[in-house]
């Protein structure tokens, strides 16, 4: 059956032979209506990429550099299955390219000019492409030929396989630049030996190199890693201090109509029958015909790449930056230490308009990028299409798991001038009901619920976390009869109460009328029994403070709070009747952009912050008539975090624990991708 067939692309006679064997052996173990293999032979991996894009083949396994080529237009392929190494219990699908130095040296990443460097080999990922790609814009001009620029940047190097005649400085630390193990400084162990022997000041290797070469922790402690933010960390902290994370070997397919489920079904069955130590007659991860045919011989199995993970996310910002710099050879005109405009990520149409107004008033220091959901915005910040946005704590958690960092906190209670330097304790997550109802925390089952959005703190993580510990399952849509929780599955009962309009029904952005704090409260006013919001929501939308037709006649005394002990209290008493304390919303950014974002925002709030009194004829950063566009409308200022500069420290141990527990109920495709 053609639609059940996976056309595998082979790049040599030997691969084609193994592919045919793969096809025949799969036929013998799979049912006739199951997936099947067909083999397509091409001259090179690039030809395979083109063939898949043109729908002449379906799949091929590629190294990271080729995954980058596959992702570029017009190919537009995406990773669908990853090979893993190591054990099934601790599968490794990535390695980290690192810069190792001796602990007793005193320079940082931005002080490598004039040092001596040790590389694994010319054109190799961890040893050359990544470090030189990331340093590319610091190299002296002209940057072509690249080897000459590198030779003029470092004071001496060992770059195995380089041309020692044309570029003698590249072979200064290893005469002749031998391209095999005859050169004592060749490859990973060689580059590390070059550093260890004192020939070089820095070695560009894999994170595992130092562990493979120094079994003794005391010996390893004589070395450190250089981080991209110009700090150093211990060699154990490579996950937080590396030049790039590099995927090892990946199966790619078309982004649209790519048969990814079928490819996974095929490979999952293949590893069950013909994986490591499974069969004598055919082995997926070895071959009598040659090395690394179709798959790497060192692979132990396959893992399905999460569907939300596109090639940009899979390869990572640093890796793509390095490869793009090398391939395109373009550098910004401004020096790299100068802050470029900050690209703010705006959620759908309304936020985009406010962002545009901010952009005009900032004289272009702020630029705007849009996405339809918060998770899409986070992904854009991760891959460099955007730089920053302000997020609810639930999304600060997801952003943090995706490698972003908190930069500034929204403060709601501290008057100026102390605001900027004050760390507030947070706000209260509350459950609001109509005073006329007889609801309590203990009889919510079967009622109609209103939530700010799935994944947000007051509207979801806190109430659903508490509910989970009571009901011990994730079927919240069965607990409530119906509700509006923007971001839920469209056919879920938790989208039934949403107001839309139609194509935007239940979407987690302002196009859904019941989205956010104000939206969830409106849902309660018009349709629901309980709303999960922040403690300020009722006062901010009653007594004529919200002039919208639905809100202008509402009275604060018509609403009450549910307390966890089963009692109810006035909305004026959130300190004595709340579900939990929630961390304030915070601005997040990529680590490399954090300082620029902080500097610019502190400057912008001095001009457009809460000191502006007349928002009808001036731009106000923290005002959008109860819509909470870009920032919460009750923000007084953006405050420095001081030492609370990681998502764990910012959110606090208790909240991180609560959200981690709720992860078993997670519907976040982005979180799944970021924890892959």
């Amino acid at each position: 059956v053609p639609e059940k067939s996976v056309r595998w692309c082979a790049v040599s006679e030997h691969e084609a032979t193994k592919c045919q064997s793969f096809r025949d052996h799969m036929k013998s173990v799979l049912p006739s209506n199951g997936p099947s293999v067909a083999c397509v032979k091409k001259a090179s991996h690039l030809d395979c990429i083109r063939a898949i894009a043109a729908n002449e083949a379906d799949a091929v396994t590629l190294d990271a550099g080729l995954v980058y080529d596959a992702y570029l237009a017009p190919n537009n392929l995406k990773p669908v299955v990853a090979e893993f190494y190591g054990s099934k219990e601790d599968p490794q699908t990535f390695y980290y390219a690192v810069a190792v130095v001796k602990k007793d040296s005193d320079f940082q990443m931005n002080q490598l000019r004039g040092r001596k460097s040790c590389h694994t080999g010319l054109g190799r990922s961890a040893g050359w492409n990544i470090p030189i790609g990331l340093l590319y814009c610091d190299l002296p001009e002209p940057r072509k030929p690249l080897e000459k620029a590198v030779a003029n940047f470092f004071s001496g190097s060992c770059v195995p396989c380089a041309d020692g005649t044309d570029f003698p400085q590249l072979c200064q630390l290893c005469p002749g630049c031998g391209c095999s193990t005859l050169n004592q400084y060749f490859s990973y162990s060689g580059a590390f030996k070059c550093l260890k022997d004192g020939a070089g000041d820095v070695a560009f290797v894999k994170h595992s190199t130092i562990f493979e070469n120094l079994a003794n922790k005391a010996d390893r402690d004589q070395y450190e890693l250089l981080c991209l933010d110009n700090t150093r960390k211990s060699v154990d902290e490579y996950k937080d201090c590396h030049l790039a994370r590099v995927p090892s070997h990946t199966v790619v397919a078309r982004s649209v109509g790519g048969k990814e489920d079928l490819i996974w079904e095929l490979l999952n069955q293949a590893q069950e029958h013909f994986g490591k130590d499974k069969s004598k007659e055919f082995q997926l991860f070895s071959s009598p015909h040659g090395k690394d045919l179709l798959f790497k011989d060192s692979a132990h199995g396959f893992l399905k790449v999460p569907p939300r993970m596109d090639a940009k996310m899979y390869l990572g910002y640093e890796y793509i930056t390095a490869i793009r710099n090398l391939r395109e050879g373009t550098c910004p005109e401004a020096p790299t230490d100068e802050c470029k405009p900050v690209k703010w990520c705006a959620l759908s149409h309304h936020e985009r308009l406010k962002c545009d107004e901010w952009s005009v008033n900032s004289a272009g220091k702020i630029e705007c990028e849009s996405a339809e959901t918060t998770e899409d915005c986070i992904a854009k910040i991760m891959n460099g299409e955007a730089d920053a946005m302000s997020l609810d704590g639930g999304f600060v958690y997801i952003a943090g798991m995706c490698g972003l960092v908190p930069v500034l906190a929204e403060n709601y209670n501290t008057p100026n001038p102390n605001c900027e330097n004050t760390a507030e304790e947070g706000y209260f997550a509350v459950a609001v009901v109509k005073s006329s109802s007889d609801l309590t925390w203990d009889n919510l089952k079967g009622k109609k619920s209103c939530h700010t959005a799935v994944g947000r703190t007051a509207g979801w993580n806190i109430p659903m976390g508490l509910l989970y510990s009571k009901i011990n399952h994730c079927r919240f849509d069965e607990f409530f009869s119906e509700g509006c929780a923007p971001g839920s599955e469209k056919n879920s009962s938790l989208c039934k109460l949403c107001m839309g309009p139609s194509p935007n029904l239940c979407e987690p952005n302002n196009k859904e009328g019941y989205y956010g704090y104000t939206g969830a409260f409106r849902c309660l006013v018009e349709k629901g029994d309980v709303a999960f919001v922040k403690h300020q929501t009722v006062p901010q939308n009653t007594g004529g403070k919200n002039p919208d037709a639905w809100a202008k006649n509402l009275k604060e005394e018509d609403y009450e709070l549910l307390c966890l002990d089963g009692s109810r209290k006035s909305v004026q008493e959130p300190a004595n009747c709340h579900l939990a304390r929630a961390p304030n919303h915070a601005v997040v950014a990529r680590k490399d952009k954090a300082d620029c974002v902080q500097t610019l925002l502190l400057d912008q709030q001095r001009m457009f912050g809460s000191s502006v009194t007349d928002c009808s004829s001036n731009f106000c950063l923290f005002e959008s008539k109860t819509k909470d566009l870009l920032f919460r409308d009750d923000t007084v200022c953006l405050a420095k975090l001081h030492d609370r500069n990681t998502y764990e420290k910012y959110l606090g141990e208790e909240y991180v624990k609560a959200v981690t527990n709720l992860r078993k109920c997670s519907t976040s495709p982005l979180l799944e991708a970021c924890t892959f």
Partner: nanobody, 117 residues
Framework: EVQLVESGGGLVQPGGSLRLSCAAS????????MAWYRQAPGKGLELVAG???????NYRDSVKGRFTISRDNSKNTMYLQMNSLRAEDTAVYYC???????????WGQGTLVTVSS
């Protein structure tokens, strides 16, 4: 709320010029920021140029040096002078004010600019 009406569009050859006007039914003196947007066939709405109450301006990169935005508070009108027009400038052009703070979905009829030889 101020009502805005765009005019001045038309068919023009590449390299040609047009001046768009945006007339307000009420006073624009106190409006903090005004802007021109455009929407090309099958594309999303994009900010072309904006002007603050004090007259400072900002332009999208592709129109810098070719387009000039200005406002005349006494005539309650905003303008967009478009020079060196290119085929990719073909779009419906809308003016907006941000005064409502609702960042509304309400747009006028717009004025169509077609750049073609």
């Amino acid at each position: 709320e101020v009502q805005l009406v765009e005019s001045g569009g038309g068919l023009v050859q590449p390299g040609g010029s047009l001046r768009l006007s945006c007339a307000a039914s009420g006073s624009i003196f106190s409006i903090a920021t005004m802007a021109w947007y455009r929407q090309a066939p099958g594309k999303g709405l994009e900010l072309v140029a904006g002007i603050t109450r004090s007259g400072s301006t900002n332009y999208r990169d592709s129109v810098k040096g070719r387009f000039t935005i200005s406002r005349d508070n006494s005539k309650n009108t905003m303008y967009l002078q478009m020079n060196s027009l290119r085929a990719e400038d073909t779009a419906v052009y809308y003016c907006t004010d941000y005064s409502s703070r609702y960042y509304h979905d309400y747009w006028g009829q717009g004025t169509l600019v077609t750049v073609s030889s």
